[in-house]
Interface confidence: medium
């Protein structure tokens, strides 16, 4: 039975040209995390594999940096970066846990961080 929960940075906003950290945290399970995938809609951004470390998809190498931790840093943000981001935790023996983050990239300086929330 899957008992874990994923806590994410939730709905967040950032300024165009700036950077943002996407963070997820898996709790309430003793399952071993073997890999974390970061995806934007259907595009793979990055992989953090327990044995092999980080792989950033070639098309995002210039603007995506690994970390901190299992998180992902997006740099040089554009309005086109607005949308849903998913952290997908592959675990053993539980299986797969998915967290969702919505990022809005704003033209002005009114960007504020949203509240944290949990996805069961």
């Amino acid at each position: 039975m899957m008992t874990g929960t994923i806590e994410t940075t939730g709905n967040i906003s950032a300024e165009k040209g700036g950077s943002i950290i996407l963070q997820c945290h898996l709790s309430s399970t003793t399952a071993q995390v073997t890999q974390v995938n970061w995806e934007q809609q259907d595009q793979l951004l990055a992989i953090c594999n327990a044995d092999l470390g980080w792989h950033i998809s070639p098309s995002f190498k210039d603007r995506v940096a690994p970390g901190p931790g299992l998180g992902l840093t997006l740099q040089s943000l554009t309005v086109n970066d607005t949308g849903e981001y998913f952290c997908i935790y592959h675990t053993y023996p539980d299986g797969t846990y998915t967290g969702r983050i919505f990022l809005e990239v704003l033209e002005s300086s009114v960007a504020e961080h949203g509240a944290r929330f949990q996805i069961p």
Partner: nanobody, 120 residues
Framework: EVQLVESGGGLVQPGGSLRLSCAAS????????MGWFRQAPGKEREMVAA????????LYADSVKGRFTISADNSKNTAYLQMNSLKPEDTAVYYC?????????????WGQGTLVTVSS
């Protein structure tokens, strides 16, 4: 039917080299993450290297970086692991796996493995 057949293992002295092969059938390597894993007696199976044929990206575990090289010959549908400067701690059964990074908690297809023994 998907089949993976490893070969090339054997007994080698410390500091020596071996080249492992993984002949794949039933699918094409193109578009797949292929991985080499190893399992030493009494230890968990660990991934040592993986390669993305479409992008050519290769990942290595810290313990083998600079000594092992993963490659492929798409015309032969075969993956390779060149192992140099071998150490006694490299002794293990080596396996190749298809879709190595798709979900590292569950692997659909495994070969039978090839034993590598590093000893003087």
């Amino acid at each position: 039917e998907v089949q993976l057949v490893e070969s090339g293992g054997g007994l080698v002295q410390p500091g020596g080299s071996l080249r492992l092969s993984c002949a794949a059938s039933g699918f094409t390597l193109s578009g797949n993450w292929m991985g080499w894993f190893r399992q030493a007696p009494g230890k968990e199976r660990e991934m040592v290297a993986a390669i993305d044929w479409s992008g050519g990206s290769a990942l290595y575990a810290d313990s083998v970086k600079g000594r092992f090289t993963i490659s492929a010959d798409n015309s032969k549908n075969t993956a390779y692991l060149q192992m140099n400067s071998l150490k006694p701690e490299d002794t293990a059964v080596y396996y190749c796996a298809k879709d190595a990074l798709s979900n590292s908690a569950r692997f659909d297809h495994w070969g039978q493995g090839t034993l590598v023994t590093v000893s003087s």
